[in-house]
């Protein structure tokens, strides 16, 4: 069977690791150095993708994979396959074209990456701002306004401390 | 150039094994990725098993399970173990290197 098949198409039968090559009346040929083909049938093997500069390699290459990168420290992937590395910038920053800029009041970053979004509008949701929001940290809503009236609290109140040295009685 | 010269074909029967060997010479720096092909009268040469350049051994499907090919580097060979032979594996095989070929060993594989 496989005799028959590589007759009608001789390339068909090339697997993962090699490409069909002309040069060679289409025998399958197994991948020059530093190259890949990562699925059968294929016509030429990929170059190896270099981790270099910035990239640091996460997965060496193989005859059937292409390497794979990450980001040195102080940097994170962007892209499909970490095809960019980016500048970290520390929480409560955000990278602009002159480099990490603080975020504006009223603003958040939580994270080493990313853009500063504004803190929560609590009271959209009828709702407090129960703690006050910082350039790294959005707010923290609360119960609303209403909750907070006389009677409405469903915790309950704390008992009286005792005073020292009276038993009780 | 590397020179390539194949032994270890023969006569043997159905469930049988026979061990190639694949001896290098020459300019063996460039013998990163090697190979055993086979090839029956009239027929296209095929791709049996190789050891790629990131020193990995590879088989096509009809080889799997059967077939073993390793290299000693202090002997400059490389050998393909085949074990569980079949009437369908009789062939030559020759060894290979970039453009470097043996010049074939007969395995006949007959009761």
């Known amino acids: 069977f496989e005799r028959t098949r590589s007759l009608q198409d001789p390339c068909s039968n090339c697997p993962a690791g090699t490409f069909c090559d002309n040069n060679r009346n289409q025998i399958c040929s197994p991948c020059p150095p530093n190259s890949f083909s990562s699925a059968g049938g294929q016509r030429t093997c990929d170059i190896c993708r270099q981790c270099k500069g910035v990239f640091r390699t996460r997965k060496e290459c193989s005859s059937t994979s292409n390497a794979e990168c990450d980001c040195t420290p102080g940097f994170h992937c962007l892209g499909a396959g970490c095809s960019m590395c980016e500048q970290d910038c520390k929480q409560g920053q955000e990278l602009t074209k002159k480099g990490c800029k603080d975020c504006c009041f009223g603003t958040f970053n939580d994270q080493k990456r990313g853009i500063c979004r504004p803190w929560t509008n609590c009271s959209l949701d009828g709702k407090s701002v129960l703690v006050n929001g910082t350039k790294e940290r959005d707010v923290v809503c609360g119960p609303s306004p209403a909750d907070l009236s006389p009677g409405a609290s469903s915790v309950t109140p704390p008992a009286p401390a005792r005073e020292p040295g009276h038993s009780p009685q | 150039a590397v020179q390539l010269v194949e032994s270890g074909g023969g006569l043997v029967q159905p469930g049988g094994s026979l061990r190639l060997s694949c001896a290098a010479s020459?300019?063996?720096?460039?013998?990163?990725?090697i190979a055993w092909y086979r090839q029956g009268p009239g027929k296209q040469r095929e791709l049996v098993a190789w050891i790629a350049w990131d020193d990995i051994a590879h088989y096509v499907d009809s080889a799997k399970g059967r077939f073993a090919i390793w290299r000693d580097n202090t002997k400059k060979t490389t050998y393909l173990q085949m074990n569980s032979l079949k009437l369908e594996d009789t062939d030559v095989y020759y060894c290979n290197s970039g453009d470097s070929w043996g010049q074939g060993t007969q395995v006949t594989v007959s009761s």
């Open positions: 020459g300019n063996i720096s460039s013998l990163r990725v």
